[in-house]
């Protein structure tokens, strides 16, 4: 029997004719336990993208170790984020726009050596962090796929998949696939190579597109492909629009496993004002699918706040000396060190959400039901069988308002209780663990609530 966390009751000897036995409430109630879905590792938590190893490592006082070795020293940090996989690079040799000088089998010495990489893989494995390698070929150039030499490049990718699978990587990412001619058929072929090696290997494709039809056509012939896109960044950050985008996507893809992010590579701060970062973290961690973040999303890293830093690869702010050129530009509350010490920080919220996402059945693989609520709100329930259930209410608006939850939208299997316990709020000031009356629920501007309630027969 699957290990759901059912209430256990001790039945007395008299009840059982002299034999003492543990029987769960579920057995008394009779309905059988719902069959658990097969879950791959990428279903169990977030992925963390490190597109630029040098920026992630930080420069200045950290620039002398090869960035791949430096990353090995940061695995404990990644473990503390409870992320399940690391999407790394690209790190291969690529001379801008030169196919002949692009070698997907060779690591650019700027990042380290093959030995450094092998050592990273071993260390990551020990910590149960999977490593996904980005093989986007011309990552330094104008067109990521050298538009004129598609077949040459496709052959290089095929060879690279086989080489790196043998080397022990857990999956691959290719980005900007809107620039790849016949992307669907190439992706199908690369997917076959990846899955042919092991069903436990993952292929991620990224596109800049936000168009649902284009996204669906890419997914059509690739059933297990994980696709990152700019789909959600088109929401205009309103509750109604976000709700319709999410529900449309889930309906159109037949509820197949998907990923959630705002883009294929960029930071959340590229799209969102600071006041919505917490709300989006809560949403990305609680939608059905794999949340995908970029390094720095957990602290609200924002290139615009760091004069002279490249938008696409701002330096990771480990502490106040990570951006040393302008004294005072970085305050403690912008850094990993500062936020780690503050239970009310964005980083602390990220860690809590990631922890919940990786251990609660309803969030791991539960059903999803969105339902109507007040203007500017997006609310939904996650539930799985007789496990604890979760209610998410998100206020995208600039004004506080009543939740106005319309429970009548929900199927009988997912009905709302009168009260639910507050697990967390994205805003300070609420007492966590306290029961909230759902009919009288009010939300602050930009507030998101995560509430829990038990299954009731």
């Amino acid at each position: 029997h699957h290990h759901h966390h059912h209430e256990q009751k001790l039945i007395s000897e008299e009840d059982l004719g002299g034999e003492q036995k543990l029987i769960s409430e579920e057995d008394l109630r009779a309905p059988r336990c719902r069959e658990l879905p097969a879950q791959k590792w990428w279903h169990t938590g977030a992925l963390y993208r490190i597109g630029d190893l040098q920026a992630f490592q930080g420069h200045g006082a950290g620039n002398l170790a090869a960035p791949i070795s430096g990353l090995k020293g940061r695995l404990d940090y990644l473990s503390s984020l409870k992320v399940k996989g690391l999407v790394l690079g690209p790190i291969h040799k690529n001379q801008k726009d030169d196919v002949a000088q692009t070698d997907l089998l060779q690591i650019d010495p700027n990042f380290g050596s093959k030995e450094d990489f092998d050592s990273l893989l071993q260390s990551a494995k020990k910590k149960s962090i999977r490593v996904i390698l980005d093989l986007t070929p011309n990552y330094r150039g104008e067109n990521s796929w050298f538009s004129t030499q598609v077949d040459t490049v496709a052959t290089k990718v095929k060879d690279a998949l086989e080489f790196w699978l043998q080397a022990g990587v857990d999956g691959f990412q290719v980005r900007d696939i809107e620039n790849l001619k016949d992307a669907s058929s190439f992706l199908a072929e690369w997917q076959n190579i990846t899955k042919g090696f092991s069903e436990d290997r993952l292929l991620i494709a990224g596109t800049n597109s936000s168009d649902l039809q284009q996204i669906l056509s890419l997914l059509e012939s690739n059933k297990d492909l994980l696709l990152t896109s700019s789909y959600l960044s088109d929401s205009g950050s309103t509750g109604e629009h976000t709700k319709s985008l999410v529900t449309q996507y889930l309906n159109a893809t037949g509820n197949r496993w998907c990923s959630w992010s705002l883009s294929q590579a960029r930071l959340l701060t590229s799209f969102l004002p600071a006041q919505l970062l917490r709300l989006y973290q809560l949403m990305l961690f609680t939608l059905p699918g794999t949340p995908v973040f970029s390094y720095g999303d957990e602290i609200g890293l924002d290139a615009a706040a760091l004069p002279g830093q490249p938008m696409e690869a701002p330096v990771m702010l480990w502490d106040e000396s990570s951006f040393p050129d302008i004294p005072g530009a970085v305050s403690a509350n912008m850094t990993v060190k500062g936020q780690s010490e503050d239970p009310g920080s964005l980083l602390s919220l990220f860690r809590r959400l990631s922890d919940q996402r990786s251990k609660e059945r309803s969030l791991l693989h539960g059903d999803f039901h969105a339902f109507s609520a007040g203007p500017g709100l997006f609310s939904y329930i996650r539930h799985w069988d007789q496990n604890e259930r979760f209610l998410v209410v998100l206020n995208f608006g600039d004004v506080g308002l009543s939740a106005g939850l319309q429970a009548s939208d929900l199927p009988a299997s997912a009905s709302l209780p009168a009260k639910a316990d507050l697990l967390l709020s994205t805003q300070p000031g609420r007492e966590e663990g306290s029961p909230l009356e759902l009919e009288r629920l009010k939300l602050e501007p930009h507030e998101g609530l995560l509430l829990r309630f038990p299954y009731a027969a």
Epitope: H59, N63, A313, F323, D325
Partner: antibody, heavy 125, light 108 residues
Amino acid sequence: QVQLVQSGAEVKRPGASVKVSCKASGYIFTGYYIHWLRQAPGQGLEWMGWINPNSGDTNYIQKFQGRVTMTRDTSISTAYMDLSRLRSDDTAVFYCARIQVYYDGGIYNYPLHHWGQGTLVTVSS
Amino acid sequence: EIVLTQSPGTLSLSPGERATLSCRASQSVSSSYLAWYQQKPGQAPRLLIYGASSRATGIPDRFSGSGSGTDFTLTISRLEPEDFAVYYCQQYGSSPWTFGQGTKVEIK
């Protein structure tokens, strides 16, 4: 702006030690390694090693192992290079230097951009 | 360690002329990590080129760098009076960081 200001010229006897200081300003001192280099009269530049002001970690080239000690005092944003058992062929100008971070063509780059004015150490009996 | 050999040792040219300085490495250097410096008597070195071909902030465009692997070149397209100095190449891709012995560009 970034400035590295070194201590003044020194004259030392063979066998003695010299301690050269390098005071940093215009940036957060703990954010960048301080590198030390030397240049004998009429000769080329020779890199001696570095100190990480954040942690105090050091790395010296083989040639100077056992004779050089690099330290720092973060409270006054100053790095020090101590060279012991001086010989006459240690007569040189000693420089402290710091990298500048450039982002170019998708790669971060770290050349030595900021230099102290140099400290002449003369070893003579 | 990587040994850098500069040639010629001395280059005698007139203002307005083109100067081509060479730097050869004993083993391949990541072109991202090769720099050129200018040094005048009594002064600290000044960074001209980093990453083999990128000009440092404030360096005039008459200075250009090229090359990869083991062969690198610094070119000064039209020598100005203030360009007469000693030029050093340096690799900072593998420890220990090393410099060439220098090329002196003097007025003919």
